[in-house]
Protein backbone atom coordinates (compact mmCIF):
# COMPACT_ATOMS: atom_id res chain seq x y z
CA UNK A 1 0.00 0.00 0.00
CA UNK A 2 1.57 3.27 -1.10
CA UNK A 3 0.13 5.24 1.82
CA UNK A 4 1.78 2.97 4.36
CA UNK A 5 4.80 4.65 5.93
CA UNK A 6 6.65 2.21 8.16
CA UNK A 7 8.64 3.72 10.99
CA UNK A 8 12.17 2.53 10.35
CA UNK A 9 13.71 5.60 11.98
CA UNK A 10 12.64 8.58 14.09
CA UNK A 11 10.39 11.16 12.44
CA UNK A 12 12.08 14.17 10.89
CA UNK A 13 10.60 17.65 10.94
CA UNK A 14 11.12 20.71 8.77
CA UNK A 15 12.47 23.56 10.89
CA UNK A 16 13.10 27.24 10.33
CA UNK A 17 16.83 27.93 10.27
CA UNK A 18 18.11 31.41 11.02
CA UNK A 19 21.71 32.38 11.57
CA UNK A 20 25.14 32.31 10.01
CA UNK A 21 25.42 28.54 10.39
CA UNK A 22 22.41 28.12 8.11
CA UNK A 23 24.41 29.27 5.08
CA UNK A 24 22.06 30.06 2.23
CA UNK A 25 19.31 27.86 3.65
CA UNK A 26 16.31 29.14 5.55
CA UNK A 27 15.35 25.71 6.85
CA UNK A 28 16.77 22.41 8.03
CA UNK A 29 15.42 18.98 8.90
CA UNK A 30 15.83 17.25 12.22
CA UNK A 31 14.26 15.28 15.00
CA UNK A 32 13.65 18.47 16.97
CA UNK A 33 13.44 22.17 16.10
CA UNK A 34 14.72 24.90 18.39
CA UNK A 35 14.64 28.63 18.92
CA UNK A 36 17.25 30.17 21.18
CA UNK A 37 18.30 33.48 22.64
CA UNK A 38 21.58 34.21 24.31
CA UNK A 39 23.45 37.28 25.49
CA UNK A 40 26.83 37.99 23.93
CA UNK A 41 28.71 41.15 24.86
CA UNK A 42 25.42 42.81 25.70
CA UNK A 43 23.76 41.84 22.44
CA UNK A 44 20.75 39.58 22.09
CA UNK A 45 21.65 36.71 19.80
CA UNK A 46 18.68 34.90 18.26
CA UNK A 47 19.09 31.54 16.56
CA UNK A 48 16.79 28.94 15.06
CA UNK A 49 17.57 25.51 13.69
CA UNK A 50 17.31 21.82 14.35
CA UNK A 51 18.83 18.91 16.16
CA UNK A 52 19.33 16.08 13.68
CA UNK A 53 20.21 13.67 16.45
CA UNK A 54 17.65 13.54 19.25
CA UNK A 55 20.21 12.99 21.99
CA UNK A 56 22.02 16.10 20.86
CA UNK A 57 19.12 18.30 21.87
CA UNK A 58 17.94 16.28 24.84
CA UNK A 59 19.96 18.03 27.54
CA UNK A 60 19.88 21.42 25.84
CA UNK A 61 16.11 21.37 25.54
CA UNK A 62 15.69 20.43 29.18
CA UNK A 63 17.94 23.23 30.43
CA UNK A 64 15.85 25.88 32.18
CA UNK A 65 16.28 29.47 30.98
CA UNK A 66 19.07 31.43 32.67
CA UNK A 67 19.76 35.19 32.59
CA UNK A 68 22.21 34.60 29.74
CA UNK A 69 20.57 31.96 27.61
CA UNK A 70 17.21 30.36 26.79
CA UNK A 71 16.27 27.57 24.40
CA UNK A 72 12.85 26.37 23.36
CA UNK A 73 12.47 23.10 21.50
CA UNK A 74 9.53 21.55 19.70
CA UNK A 75 8.59 18.70 17.40
CA UNK A 76 6.48 19.30 14.31
CA UNK A 77 6.96 20.73 10.83
CA UNK A 78 7.94 24.42 11.09
CA UNK A 79 7.04 24.38 14.80
CA UNK A 80 9.80 26.88 15.64
CA UNK A 81 8.53 29.43 13.12
CA UNK A 82 6.53 31.45 15.65
CA UNK A 83 8.60 30.63 18.72
CA UNK A 84 10.86 33.32 20.13
CA UNK A 85 12.87 32.21 23.13
CA UNK A 86 12.51 34.50 26.14
CA UNK A 87 15.05 35.19 28.83
CA UNK A 88 13.62 35.03 32.34
CA UNK A 89 12.41 38.44 33.49
CA UNK A 90 14.09 39.91 36.53
CA UNK A 91 11.91 42.95 36.93
CA UNK A 92 14.33 45.07 34.94
CA UNK A 93 15.99 44.79 31.57
CA UNK A 94 19.65 44.06 31.15
CA UNK A 95 21.52 47.36 30.85
CA UNK A 96 22.88 48.30 27.47
CA UNK A 97 21.39 45.39 25.57
CA UNK A 98 20.45 45.65 21.93
CA UNK A 99 18.66 43.21 19.68
CA UNK A 100 21.00 41.86 17.06
CA UNK A 101 19.31 39.12 15.08
CA UNK A 102 21.35 36.22 13.73
CA UNK A 103 24.68 37.28 15.19
CA UNK A 104 27.61 35.22 16.34
CA UNK A 105 26.66 31.74 15.20
CA UNK A 106 28.95 28.80 14.81
CA UNK A 107 28.46 25.88 12.49
CA UNK A 108 28.43 22.69 14.48
CA UNK A 109 28.65 19.54 12.42
CA UNK A 110 28.12 16.05 13.75
CA UNK A 111 31.53 14.58 12.96
CA UNK A 112 30.54 11.12 14.09
CA UNK A 113 27.73 11.03 11.58
CA UNK A 114 29.43 12.99 8.84
CA UNK A 115 26.87 15.74 9.02
CA UNK A 116 26.40 18.85 6.98
CA UNK A 117 23.50 20.02 9.09
CA UNK A 118 22.56 23.33 10.63
CA UNK A 119 23.08 22.10 14.13
CA UNK A 120 23.88 23.73 17.39
CA UNK A 121 25.25 21.94 20.42
CA UNK A 122 24.63 22.55 24.08
CA UNK A 123 28.18 23.84 24.39
CA UNK A 124 27.53 26.27 21.55
CA UNK A 125 24.36 27.58 23.14
CA UNK A 126 26.31 28.29 26.32
CA UNK A 127 29.33 29.57 24.40
CA UNK A 128 28.37 33.23 24.55
CA UNK A 129 27.96 33.79 28.26
CA UNK A 130 30.91 31.60 29.17
CA UNK A 131 33.21 34.08 27.48
Amino acid sequence: MEDEKPKVNPKLYMCVCEGLSCGNEDHCEGQQCFSSLSINDGFHVYQKGCFQVYEQGKMTCKTPPSPGQAVECCQGDWCNRNITAQLPTKGKSFPGTQNFHLEEQKLISEEDLGGEQKLISEEDLHHHHHH
Epitope: E2, N9, C28, Q117
Partner: antibody
Framework: QVQLVESGGGLVKPGGSLRLSCAAS????????MSWIRQAPGKGLEWVSY????????YYADSVKGRFTISRDNAKNSLNLQMSSLRAEDTAVYFC???????WGQGTLVTVSS | KIVLTQTPLSSPVTLGQPASISCRSS???????????LSWLHQRPGQPPRLLIY???NRLSGVPDRFSGSGAGTDFTLKISRVEAEDVGVYYC??????????FGGGTKVEIK
Protein backbone atom coordinates in the same frame (compact mmCIF):
# COMPACT_ATOMS: atom_id res chain seq x y z
CA GLN B 1 4.07 2.72 -9.12
CA VAL B 2 7.29 3.77 -7.41
CA GLN B 3 10.36 3.30 -9.59
CA LEU B 4 14.01 3.99 -8.83
CA VAL B 5 16.57 3.40 -11.58
CA GLU B 6 20.28 3.77 -10.88
CA SER B 7 22.87 4.45 -13.57
CA GLY B 8 26.49 5.54 -13.92
CA GLY B 9 28.25 2.47 -12.54
CA GLY B 10 31.25 0.94 -14.26
CA LEU B 11 34.93 0.13 -14.02
CA VAL B 12 37.22 2.82 -12.65
CA LYS B 13 40.84 2.90 -11.54
CA PRO B 14 41.80 3.54 -7.90
CA GLY B 15 41.89 7.28 -7.26
CA GLY B 16 39.38 7.87 -10.04
CA SER B 17 35.93 9.42 -9.96
CA LEU B 18 32.43 8.35 -10.91
CA ARG B 19 29.00 9.93 -10.73
CA LEU B 20 25.98 7.78 -10.00
CA SER B 21 22.43 8.88 -10.72
CA CYS B 22 19.05 7.62 -9.61
CA ALA B 23 15.96 8.51 -11.63
CA ALA B 24 12.79 8.49 -9.55
CA SER B 25 9.21 8.22 -10.75
CA UNK B 26 5.75 7.26 -9.50
CA UNK B 27 5.79 9.49 -6.42
CA UNK B 28 6.36 13.08 -5.35
CA UNK B 29 10.14 13.03 -5.15
CA UNK B 30 10.47 16.18 -3.03
CA UNK B 31 8.34 14.64 -0.26
CA UNK B 32 10.91 12.00 0.62
CA UNK B 33 14.43 11.84 1.88
CA MET B 34 16.71 9.52 -0.06
CA SER B 35 19.65 7.27 0.74
CA TRP B 36 22.45 5.46 -1.02
CA ILE B 37 23.23 2.00 0.33
CA ARG B 38 25.90 -0.29 -1.05
CA GLN B 39 26.66 -3.99 -1.07
CA ALA B 40 30.11 -5.36 -1.82
CA PRO B 41 30.08 -8.59 -3.86
CA GLY B 42 28.94 -11.46 -1.65
CA LYS B 43 28.81 -9.18 1.39
CA GLY B 44 26.22 -7.39 3.51
CA LEU B 45 24.57 -4.00 3.27
CA GLU B 46 26.28 -0.72 4.18
CA TRP B 47 24.55 2.65 4.45
CA VAL B 48 26.54 5.25 2.50
CA SER B 49 24.75 8.57 2.51
CA TYR B 50 21.48 10.35 3.17
CA UNK B 51 19.94 13.57 1.87
CA UNK B 52 16.90 15.38 3.23
CA UNK B 53 13.80 16.30 1.27
CA UNK B 54 15.06 19.72 0.21
CA UNK B 55 18.73 18.79 0.11
CA UNK B 56 19.58 21.05 3.04
CA UNK B 57 20.81 18.17 5.17
CA UNK B 58 23.37 15.57 4.12
CA TYR B 59 25.03 12.77 6.01
CA TYR B 60 27.79 10.33 5.13
CA ALA B 61 29.21 7.11 6.52
CA ASP B 62 32.70 7.55 7.94
CA SER B 63 34.08 5.28 5.22
CA VAL B 64 33.14 7.74 2.44
CA LYS B 65 33.21 11.09 4.24
CA GLY B 66 35.20 13.71 2.33
CA ARG B 67 35.23 11.59 -0.84
CA PHE B 68 31.55 11.22 -1.75
CA THR B 69 29.00 13.98 -2.27
CA ILE B 70 25.25 13.37 -2.36
CA SER B 71 22.91 15.78 -4.14
CA ARG B 72 19.42 15.91 -5.54
CA ASP B 73 17.47 17.84 -8.14
CA ASN B 74 13.82 17.89 -7.13
CA ALA B 75 12.83 19.53 -10.42
CA LYS B 76 14.30 16.59 -12.34
CA ASN B 77 13.36 13.86 -9.82
CA SER B 78 16.97 12.78 -9.63
CA LEU B 79 19.38 11.74 -6.91
CA ASN B 80 23.15 11.80 -7.45
CA LEU B 81 26.27 10.47 -5.79
CA GLN B 82 29.56 12.01 -6.86
CA MET B 83 32.36 9.62 -5.90
CA SER B 84 36.02 10.62 -5.97
CA SER B 85 39.34 9.22 -4.69
CA LEU B 86 37.83 5.79 -5.22
CA ARG B 87 39.38 2.77 -3.52
CA ALA B 88 39.19 -0.97 -4.15
CA GLU B 89 36.97 -1.28 -1.06
CA ASP B 90 34.37 0.95 -2.72
CA THR B 91 33.64 -1.85 -5.17
CA ALA B 92 29.97 -2.68 -4.67
CA VAL B 93 26.47 -2.56 -6.05
CA TYR B 94 25.07 0.86 -5.16
CA PHE B 95 21.35 1.09 -4.43
CA CYS B 96 19.30 4.24 -4.10
CA UNK B 97 16.46 3.86 -1.65
CA UNK B 98 13.45 5.97 -0.77
CA UNK B 99 12.31 6.75 2.73
CA UNK B 100 11.64 4.67 4.68
CA UNK B 101 13.68 2.03 2.81
CA UNK B 102 10.41 0.69 1.50
CA UNK B 103 11.50 1.15 -2.10
CA TRP B 104 14.88 0.33 -3.63
CA GLY B 105 16.33 0.50 -7.10
CA GLN B 106 17.90 -2.56 -8.73
CA GLY B 107 21.37 -1.14 -8.14
CA THR B 108 24.37 -0.23 -10.28
CA LEU B 109 27.74 -1.97 -10.01
CA VAL B 110 30.85 0.08 -9.33
CA THR B 111 34.15 -1.74 -9.76
CA VAL B 112 37.36 -0.08 -8.61
CA SER B 113 40.36 -1.93 -9.97
CA SER B 114 43.62 -1.25 -11.75
CA LYS C 1 28.40 3.28 16.28
CA ILE C 2 25.82 0.58 16.87
CA VAL C 3 26.92 -2.92 15.80
CA LEU C 4 24.32 -5.56 14.97
CA THR C 5 25.34 -9.21 15.22
CA GLN C 6 23.18 -11.82 13.51
CA THR C 7 23.14 -15.53 14.21
CA PRO C 8 23.24 -18.01 12.67
CA LEU C 9 25.24 -17.11 9.58
CA SER C 10 23.41 -19.78 7.63
CA SER C 11 20.19 -21.65 8.35
CA PRO C 12 19.38 -24.73 6.26
CA VAL C 13 15.71 -25.55 6.80
CA THR C 14 13.19 -28.10 5.59
CA LEU C 15 10.17 -26.76 3.71
CA GLY C 16 7.25 -26.34 6.07
CA GLN C 17 9.49 -26.23 9.13
CA PRO C 18 10.14 -23.13 11.26
CA ALA C 19 13.23 -20.94 11.13
CA SER C 20 14.53 -18.44 13.64
CA ILE C 21 17.11 -15.66 13.24
CA SER C 22 18.64 -13.70 16.08
CA CYS C 23 19.92 -10.11 16.01
CA ARG C 24 21.85 -8.66 18.93
CA SER C 25 22.71 -4.96 19.21
CA SER C 26 25.81 -3.54 20.89
CA UNK C 27 23.57 -1.05 22.68
CA UNK C 28 19.90 -0.54 23.40
CA UNK C 29 17.81 0.39 20.37
CA UNK C 30 15.14 2.14 22.43
CA UNK C 31 14.97 5.71 21.11
CA UNK C 32 14.24 8.70 23.34
CA UNK C 33 10.83 8.94 21.69
CA UNK C 34 9.94 5.52 23.11
CA UNK C 35 10.06 3.55 19.88
CA UNK C 36 12.59 0.84 19.04
CA UNK C 37 13.70 1.21 15.44
CA LEU C 38 14.66 -2.36 14.59
CA SER C 39 13.64 -3.61 11.14
CA TRP C 40 14.06 -6.80 9.14
CA LEU C 41 14.74 -7.00 5.40
CA HIS C 42 14.84 -9.92 2.99
CA GLN C 43 17.04 -10.12 -0.09
CA ARG C 44 16.64 -12.74 -2.75
CA PRO C 45 19.61 -13.49 -5.03
CA GLY C 46 20.10 -10.79 -7.67
CA GLN C 47 17.42 -8.53 -6.18
CA PRO C 48 17.41 -5.48 -3.93
CA PRO C 49 16.42 -5.94 -0.29
CA ARG C 50 12.74 -5.78 0.66
CA LEU C 51 11.48 -4.39 3.96
CA LEU C 52 9.50 -6.98 5.91
CA ILE C 53 9.13 -5.80 9.49
CA TYR C 54 9.66 -2.50 11.32
CA UNK C 55 9.68 -1.35 14.96
CA UNK C 56 10.43 -4.91 16.08
CA UNK C 57 7.17 -6.60 15.18
CA ASN C 58 5.10 -4.62 12.68
CA ARG C 59 4.67 -6.43 9.38
CA LEU C 60 4.56 -4.38 6.21
CA SER C 61 1.32 -4.85 4.28
CA GLY C 62 1.65 -7.77 1.90
CA VAL C 63 4.10 -9.62 4.13
CA PRO C 64 2.72 -13.08 4.99
CA ASP C 65 1.77 -13.66 8.62
CA ARG C 66 4.18 -16.57 8.85
CA PHE C 67 6.80 -13.87 9.47
CA SER C 68 6.92 -12.45 12.98
CA GLY C 69 9.33 -10.27 14.87
CA SER C 70 9.92 -10.03 18.60
CA GLY C 71 12.40 -8.78 21.15
CA ALA C 72 13.31 -5.67 23.11
CA GLY C 73 16.29 -3.51 24.02
CA THR C 74 19.27 -5.29 22.49
CA ASP C 75 17.93 -8.75 21.55
CA PHE C 76 15.60 -9.39 18.64
CA THR C 77 14.30 -12.39 16.73
CA LEU C 78 12.73 -12.97 13.33
CA LYS C 79 10.68 -16.17 13.07
CA ILE C 80 9.26 -17.88 10.01
CA SER C 81 6.62 -20.30 11.23
CA ARG C 82 6.63 -22.52 8.13
CA VAL C 83 9.34 -21.90 5.56
CA GLU C 84 8.24 -21.79 1.92
CA ALA C 85 10.43 -21.94 -1.19
CA GLU C 86 10.06 -18.20 -1.82
CA ASP C 87 11.54 -17.44 1.62
CA VAL C 88 15.08 -18.40 0.64
CA GLY C 89 17.64 -15.62 0.57
CA VAL C 90 19.46 -13.45 3.05
CA TYR C 91 17.74 -11.75 5.98
CA TYR C 92 19.14 -8.58 7.50
CA CYS C 93 18.26 -6.76 10.68
CA UNK C 94 18.68 -2.98 10.57
CA UNK C 95 18.65 -0.27 13.22
CA UNK C 96 17.32 3.22 12.61
CA UNK C 97 17.51 4.44 16.20
CA UNK C 98 20.83 6.18 15.53
CA UNK C 99 19.44 7.74 12.36
CA UNK C 100 20.78 8.92 10.01
CA UNK C 101 23.60 6.45 10.69
CA UNK C 102 21.71 3.30 9.74
CA UNK C 103 23.48 0.02 10.40
CA PHE C 104 22.74 -3.49 9.22
CA GLY C 105 23.45 -6.90 10.65
CA GLY C 106 25.80 -9.16 8.73
CA GLY C 107 22.95 -11.20 7.29
CA THR C 108 21.62 -14.72 7.71
CA LYS C 109 21.27 -16.99 4.71
CA VAL C 110 18.14 -19.13 4.71
CA GLU C 111 18.33 -22.11 2.35
CA ILE C 112 16.34 -25.26 1.80
CA LYS C 113 17.89 -28.53 2.98
Amino acid sequence: QVQLVESGGGLVKPGGSLRLSCAASGFTFSDYYMSWIRQAPGKGLEWVSYISRTGSTKYYADSVKGRFTISRDNAKNSLNLQMSSLRAEDTAVYFCAREPLQHWGQGTLVTVSS
Amino acid sequence: KIVLTQTPLSSPVTLGQPASISCRSSQSLVHSDGDTYLSWLHQRPGQPPRLLIYTISNRLSGVPDRFSGSGAGTDFTLKISRVEAEDVGVYYCMQGTQFPALTFGGGTKVEIK
